[in-house]
Interface confidence: low
């Protein structure tokens, strides 16, 4: 990766001597890119979602490396300066979780609770066991919602 | 995983002309500067040639000892690098490199000028 | 152009030991705070392989045993401990201006 520093020079040129000038990115204005800043660097371009920087932005100037996530594994789901994919989630079945859309290079694990498990929170990191109701249903557990029992001595419909 | 192969190295003629082909792969080529680096036998590493991407208006750039002689190329459709060669001479022969700018390096290929 | 002067040109080191070759530029190789200067370990019949970059940092799969360390115009590349596998040519390399510059090279050799 090829970058050069001069106090005189703010932009990418060819000097007198022909040798490359970079410039270095100071603001920003692109919204939603991750991993904009590193160590005090901005790099120039970013890397299409599914790829990462295959090093850091210091080394990379405004040409970036890209190599692709590890499939199943990593993802980055835009475009972004990070050397880092993000690593794909787990669906902990211990929490009640299984696997509803696999993880692709542009896209995280999509979750759901398993079969007799329901999560009413919006972003559901555990399920819970739908209640076993002893004197009869009111209403069935969904996804979302744990069953509703009977209570003791009401009378059925 | 990045793959840079490198062909189109021979036995040529001093003053003749030849053309080396870089084949690369595992990542995306045509946002990326790309090299040439040149490592005569037994000797050291020497860069030869860049290109940039066409953001950048494939500039490119050569060692003092080609320029003039030497040409520099790129596909990006078909991800392959370029190294037109003319007017060669002995001190040319070498092992020659393709080079991303994240320093990955292919194989190389064989130049031997020699009549 | 930025001349890089490595040493020494060779080096014989005992298995276990440290081994540490240097790296002079005729002027800075600093960018914006971080110096562009990358080492290489190249074997016969082998392209060169990247070690270091920036300096300090060890690229993925290298091992710990080699760490690299400078800025500015001093730069050297750390090995220990030496193992068999380390008998090698080592470059350094700067990439803050065209042309790109590579060290002579050292050779390393086991005592």
């Known amino acids: 990766r090829l970058s050069s520093k001069s106090v005189n020079a703010q932009v990418t040129d060819i000097n007198s001597k022909g040798l490359e000038l970079r410039k270095t990115v100071t603001t920003v204005e692109t919204q939603n890119l991750e991993g904009l800043h590193h160590d005090g660097q901005f790099c120039h371009k970013p890397c299409p979602p599914g790829e990462r920087k295959a090093r850091d932005c210091t080394v990379n100037g405004d040409e970036p490396d890209c190599v692709p996530c590890q499939e199943g594994k990593e993802y980055t789901d835009k475009a972004h300066f990070s050397s880092k994919c993000r690593r794909c989630r787990l669906c902990d079945e211990g929490h009640g979780l299984e696997v509803e859309i696999n993880c692709t290079r542009t896209q995280n694990t999509k979750c759901r609770c398993k079969p007799n498990f329901f999560c009413n929170s919006t972003v559901c990191e555990h399920c819970d066991p739908c209640t076993k109701c002893e004197h009869g249903i009111i209403k069935e557990c969904t996804l979302t919602s744990n069953t509703k029992c009977k209570e003791e001595g009401s009378r059925s419909n | 995983e990045v793959q840079l192969v490198e062909t189109g190295g021979g036995l040529v003629q001093p003053k003749g002309s030849l053309k080396l082909s870089c084949a690369a792969s595992g990542f995306t080529f045509n946002t990326n500067a790309m090299n040439w680096v040149r490592q005569a036998p037994g000797k050291g590493l020497e860069w030869v040639a860049r290109i940039r991407s066409k953001s950048n208006n494939y500039a490119t750039y050569y060692a003092e000892s080609v320029k003039d002689r030497f040409t520099i190329s790129r596909d990006d459709s078909q991800s392959m690098l370029y190294l037109q060669m003319n007017n060669l001479k002995a001190e040319d022969t070498a092992m020659y490199y393709c080079?991303?700018?994240?320093?990955?390096w292919g194989q190389g290929t064989t130049l031997t000028v020699s009549s | 152009d930025i001349v890089l002067t490595q040493s020494p040109a060779s080096l014989a080191v005992s298995l276990g030991q440290r081994a540490t070759i240097s790296c002079r530029a005729s002027e800075s190789v600093e960018y914006y705070g971080t110096s562009l200067m990358q080492w290489y370990q190249q074997k016969p019949g082998q392209p060169p392989k990247l070690l270091i970059y920036?300096?300090?940092n060890v690229e993925s799969g290298v091992p710990a045993r080699f760490s690299g360390s400078g800025s500015g115009t001093d730069f050297s590349l750390n090995i220990h401990p030496v193992e068999e596998d380390d008998i090698a040519m080592y470059f350094c390399q700067q990439s803050t201006k065209v042309p790109w510059t590579f060290g002579g090279g050292t050779k390393l050799e086991i005592k």
């Open positions: 920036v300096a300090s």
């Open positions: 080079v991303t700018d994240g320093y990955y």
